[in-house]
Each structure stands twice: as C-alpha cells, then as structure tokens.
C-alpha cells in the first residue's frame, strides 16, 4: 500500500533571464527512494540515480543544474519554459510517487509587480 | 582505448554456479561507470542482468534477485557475475558492459560475449 | 517491468531506402529511449541515445525521434553495413528493459 505523499512547490513564477529552484519532498513513507525523474511535459531533463548520481539530458546540459539535494535548479530561463514540470520518485517496494509544479516565466517588470512564490 | 572482455567457463551443469569476470582496461573501475551484465538468449531477446556502480553499490534485475551477486576487485579492475541453481534456461551468451552515466545514460562499452550453456 | 514492442521483427529494404523501426514503450518512458545496433556475431553498440541523439562517430543518416511511448529510429539512406538486428531500450527506471530487436534484411 503506498501511504506517501509529495510536496511541491507548487505554482511558482520567476523572472525571464533568472533561475528558479524545483522542488520536490517525499514524505509518510519508509520506502527507499531507487531514482528520482524530473520531467518537463514530453521531455525528461534528468535522472537522480540512488546508486549512480545525476545525468542531465543533453537538450538541457547548459541551463539545468542537479540539487539542491534531489531537486533542480532551472538558469537562464525563457518564456518557452513557462509549463508543468513533474517529479517522479521511484521507490522501493512502493512504486512510483508523482508531484507536479507549474512555472511561469514572466516578463521582468510583470515579474517585479506581480505575485510571487517563495520556495520554503 | 576502454576494453571489457569476458572471461568464464563454457558448460555449465543444471543446479550449479555460474562465475564470470569482466576485465576492464583503458578505464578505472571506479569513475563514473556502471558495470553491468548483460545476457543474450538464443533467439536475440537481451536482459539486463544488474550492475555494479563505480561506487560499489549495485542493483540487479528483480527476476534474478535471490539468484544473482555481483562483486568487483579494484585492485585488479574486474567485476564479476555469480548465478546460482542454473538451469537450461540460463544458456545464453553473456555481455559486460559500461553504462556511461554523466553524458548518454546508455550502454556504450561491451565486451565481446561469452556462450554459456547449461547442460548435464 | 516496462515492456519495449518491436512489433516487426524482420524488415526487408534495398540499398539508398528509408526505412524506419519502431517501438512501443508498455508506460510512459518520457525521452528515456537508447537504440543499440548489433551486427552478425558482434556485440550490440550504441547509436542513439535520449531518443534522439547521435553517439560519437555514428553516421548521420541514422536518426531517433519520439517521446512519451512511441519512438522511432531511422535510416534515411541504407547501406549494405547496416544488416544488423536493431533494438531499443529503456532507461526510466530500473530494470532496464530492451525491445525485442528487429533484423533489416537488404534486398
């Protein structure tokens, strides 16, 4: 039975040009955590292997950077990165845990006057 | 330039063991690699058997997990393969293989194969 | 586990044709996809990886494409070195699993 549960970040914004932390936590399981997938729509941007560290795909290798801990760190982004991007955390006996975040990636001066989502 | 070549006996009898080793040359064991065994039914169909990461740890295919160790000596660059109670169905050609993990997340070192059958 | 599809298993073509392989993922693999080409009593190498890119020193009339569960790899020109049995394989998640292969007859 997987009794987990996953937190996100949520709905975030950041400024175009800027970075932004994504951030997933897995939590209320003892399942051992195998890999963890990061996802943006059809595209996988990098696998966190328990045993083998991070790969980053090739499409993302200069503006994606592994961590903090199991998270990603997004650099110099654009508007064409505003989307979902999904977690997906594959344990061990559970099976597979999936948290999402949106990311809008604003304009700088909407960016400055509009709403903004602190990552914890 | 990497090389991995196989090393094992033919003929194996139903119920026993089977012990391969891996040489590895051009490459250290412990960079960044994973060491992986790799087998090959008559009939072409491939199996993914398990590795062994550079930093020792491993993960196996479930189908194989009460059956199957992989160990390695640092000091002479080699991993090995152990498959207890084997049976006919084991009669295969058997691959190591290096998994690149940082860039391409594949295969792209292997050995050259050793048959191995299972027979009294 | 996830399943690879390779619904054809022989493919006959003729030297200068395009022919394209495909394969089918059981669950979503995002662009986790490798594609390996073995010849006649040589060990598989590796020619695509992340569905869609070329690995070092392999030709560019081979190429990969898809995402999600469907990929497809291709050869816009063959020649008479590429009789090779063909195979995919996935890298989402452990076990990695591989399609059953599909073997390219020349004509």
């Known amino acids: 039975m997987m009794t987990g549960t996953i937190e996100t970040t949520g709905n975030i914004s950041a400024e175009k040009g800027g970075s932004i932390i994504l951030q997933c936590h897995l939590s209320s399981t003892t399942a051992q955590v195998t890999q963890v997938n990061w996802e943006q729509q059809d595209q996988l941007l990098a696998i966190c292997n328990a045993d083998l560290g991070w790969h980053i795909s090739p499409s993302f290798k200069d503006r994606v950077a592994p961590g903090p801990g199991l998270g990603l760190t997004l650099q110099s982004l654009t508007v064409n990165d505003t989307g979902e991007y999904f977690c997906i955390y594959h344990t061990y006996p559970d099976g597979t845990y999936t948290g999402r975040i949106f990311l809008e990636v604003l304009e700088s001066s909407v960016a400055e006057h509009g709403a903004r989502f602190q990552i914890p | 330039d990497v090389q991995l070549q196989e090393s094992g006996p033919g003929l194996v009898k139903p119920s026993q063991s089977l012990s391969l080793t891996c040489t590895v040359t051009g490459y250290s064991i412990t960079s960044d690699y994973a060491w992986n065994w790799i087998r090959q039914f008559p009939g072409n169909k491939l199996e993914w058997m398990g590795y062994?990461?550079?930093?020792?740890?491993?993960r196996s295919n479930p189908s194989l997990k009460s059956r199957i160790s992989i160990t390695r000596d640092t000091s002479k660059n080699q991993f090995f393969l152990q498959l207890n109670s084997m049976t006919a169905e084991d009669t295969a050609t058997y691959y190591c293989?290096?998994?690149?993990?940082?860039?391409?997340?594949?295969?792209?070192?292997w050995g050259q194969g050793t048959s191995v059958t299972v027979s009294s | 586990d996830i399943v690879m599809t390779q619904s054809h298993k022989f493919m006959s073509t003729s030297v200068g044709d395009r022919v394209s392989i495909t394969c089918k993922a059981s669950q979503h693999v995002s662009t986790a996809v490798a594609w390996y080409q073995q010849k006649p009593g040589q060990s598989p190498k590796l020619l695509i990886y992340s569905a869609s890119y070329r690995y070092t020193g392999v030709p560019d009339r081979f190429t990969g494409s898809g995402s999600g569960t469907d990929f497809t790899f291709t050869i816009s020109s063959v020649q008479a070195e590429d009789l090779a049995v063909y195979y995919c394989q996935q890298h989402y998640n452990t076990p990695w699993t591989f399609g059953g292969g599909t073997k390219l007859e020349i004509k």
């Open positions: 293989g290096g998994w690149e993990v940082r860039n391409y997340y594949a295969m792209d070192y």
């Open positions: 062994i990461s550079y930093s020792g740890s491993t």
